[in-house]
């Protein structure tokens, strides 16, 4: 559950994501079928650069509705190709 994920991230708060935690997050996201808004909100609360650690291909599968709550600082470390994917989604999210 999302509460279990939050508890796990709380234990690791302030520390870099370990390979084990990364694997658990990936499995959790895959299990939900997509990176939904609640999950993304949780991940960026603990790992502000989470979106910028995904490839443009991975970002393309993130639904625009999930991007709505993303803060500018969450995109600080993204490169232009990642932003090329995220900006149209953000525009769509705000239009809706």
């Amino acid at each position: 559950s999302l509460e279990t994920l939050k508890a796990l991230l709380e234990v690791n708060k302030g520390h870099e994501m370990s390979p084990q935690v990364a694997t658990l997050i990936d499995r959790f996201v895959k299990g939900r079928g997509q990176l939904d808004k609640d999950t993304l909100d949780t991940l960026t609360a603990f790992y502000p650069g989470y979106l910028c650690s995904l490839s443009p291909e991975e970002l393309s599968s993130v639904p625009p509705s999930s991007i709505w709550a993303v803060r500018p600082q969450d995109l600080d470390t993204c490169d232009p190709r990642q932003l090329d994917v995220l900006y149209p989604k953000a525009r769509l999210a705000f239009q809706n």
């Epitope: 520390h15 870099e16 994501m17 370990s18 390979p19 084990q20 935690v21 990364a22 694997t23 997050i25 991940l43 790992y47 502000p48 650069g49 989470y50 910028c52 650690s53 995904l54 490839s55 443009p56 291909e57 991975e58 600080d76 470390t77 490169d79």
Partner: nanobody, 115 residues
Amino acid sequence: QVQLVESGGGLVQAGGSLRLSCAASGSTFGRIVMRWYRQAQGKQREWVASIYDSGSTSYSDPVQGRFTISRDNARNTVYLQMNSLRPADTAVYYCNLGTALSSYWGQGTQVTVSS
């Protein structure tokens, strides 16, 4: 603590090639993106290329088709193969390691392309 050390820069004639290396030491992380940036004298730092955790790559328009980014996970090293170099490629090249939490930078290596 993460340390990034770039090497491989130097002076090369236009049309020549160089291979830059960036060796990362320190902790290992779950998801990382390795990026190369460059900064020419008096200009802003600009993004050059990225290699993502998935293994996919992307490039800025000025270097697309000429530069290739790759990595050797066993050696914790990322490379930038630069072919068909132009005077406009002259800059200090920086390696960047991005995680979901932080961003780490190397000290840079100078690349000078003479005409």
